[in-house]
């Protein structure tokens, strides 16, 4: 039975040209996190494997940095980076948990963080 929940940074906004940290946290389960995939729509951005370490997709190597922790840092943001991001936690023995973050990249200097929320 899957008892865990993923807490994410929720809906966030950031300035064009700046950077943002995408962060998820899995709680309420004793399952072992074996891998976290970061995806944007259907594109794989990065993988953090508990044993193998980090892999950043070649097409994002210049603008994506691993961490902090299991999170992901997006740099040199453009308006095209606006959209949904998913953290996919592969756990043993529970299976897969998915969290969603919506990022809006703004032209202006007004970029406020949204509220945190949970996905069961």
């Amino acid at each position: 039975m899957m008892t865990g929940t993923i807490e994410t940074t929720g809906n966030i906004s950031a300035e064009k040209g700046g950077s943002i940290i995408l962060q998820c946290h899995l709680s309420s389960t004793t399952a072992q996190v074996t891998q976290v995939n970061w995806e944007q729509q259907d594109q794989l951005l990065a993988i953090c494997n508990a044993d193998l370490g980090w892999h950043i997709s070649p097409s994002f190597k210049d603008r994506v940095a691993p961490g902090p922790g299991l999170g992901l840092t997006l740099q040199s943001l453009t308006v095209n980076d606006t959209g949904e991001y998913f953290c996919i936690y592969h756990t043993y023995p529970d299976g897969t948990y998915t969290g969603r973050i919506f990022l809006e990249v703004l032209e202006s200097s007004v970029a406020e963080h949204g509220a945190r929320f949970q996905i069961p």
């Epitope: 074996t34 995939n37 995806e39 259907d42 794989l44 993988i47 494997n49 508990a50 044993d51 193998l52 370490g53 892999h55 997709s57 996919i88 592969h90 756990t91 043993y92 023995p93 299976g95 897969t96």
Partner: antibody
């Protein structure tokens, strides 16, 4: 290029423990970023993943076999091993060792990209 | 655990024809799917990973597609050496699981 070779007895008696070793050549287990796996194939049937181990000793087992399986690694000999206890005729199969994730750093995928030739184990009295 | 189901169990195709093999996951595995080819008396060989990326040395007539729960392996023009058993495998969470296989035989 990594290469794998399975070794061990071809005949095991029921209720005994099956022991197989996989020797890795062409690279060092101690510095490799990949999983070392055992997979089996009963006669005329499909593939069944038994379990995997990382060089650090992290192990992952098939839940249906977990109570009977132990996978270990000996980095000094560049080998990893499978022990399957309390065997029955249903454990008769070709046993393969394989490497999963040898291309992880470059391509980000884990799949069984390198296989041994396989060794046939028959459980019979 | 995620159950992988392959269809059909056997596919009879003439050389030069197209073969389409299906694989279904009991729940989403995103694009974490691999395809293997196995010939009699040999170990399996990795063909496709990430659902659609050909492994090193695999001919272009092999292509993979799909994501989530539905996947397809297509062999565009079957050569004599392509008659074999094909397995899909989810590479997403532990435990790793394989489909039951599809045997591609000469019609």
């Amino acid at each position: 290029q990594l290469q794998l070779q399975e070794s061990g007895p071809g005949l095991v008696k029921p209720s005994e423990t099956l022991s197989l070793t996989c020797t890795v050549s062409g690279g060092s287990i101690s510095s490799g970023s990949y999983y070392l796996a055992w997979i089996r194939q009963p006669p005329g049937k499909g593939l069944e993943w038994i379990g995997s181990i990382f060089r650090s000793g992290s192990t992952y087992y098939n839940p249906s076999l977990e109570s009977r399986v132990t996978i270990s690694v000996d980095t000094s000999k560049n080998q990893f091993s499978l022990k399957l206890s309390s065997v029955t005729a249903a454990d008769t199969a070709v046993y393969y060792c394989a490497i999963e994730g040898a291309n992880f750093k470059d391509f980000g995928y884990v799949a069984f990209d390198i296989w041994g030739q396989g060794t046939t184990v028959t459980v019979s009295s | 655990e995620i159950v992988m189901t392959q269809s059909p169990a056997t596919l009879s195709v003439s050389p030069g024809e197209r073969a389409t093999l299906s694989c279904r996951a009991s729940k989403s595995v995103s694009s974490n799917l691999a395809w293997y080819q196995q010939k009699p008396g040999q170990a399996p060989r990795l063909l496709i990973y990430f659902a659609s990326t050909r492994a090193t040395g695999i001919p272009a007539r092999f292509s993979g597609s799909g994501s989530g729960t539905e996947f397809t392996l297509t062999i565009s023009s079957l050569q004599s050496e392509d008659f074999a058993v094909y397995y899909c495998q989810q590479t997403s969470p532990w435990p790793r699981t394989f489909g039951g296989g599809t045997k591609v035989e000469i019609k």
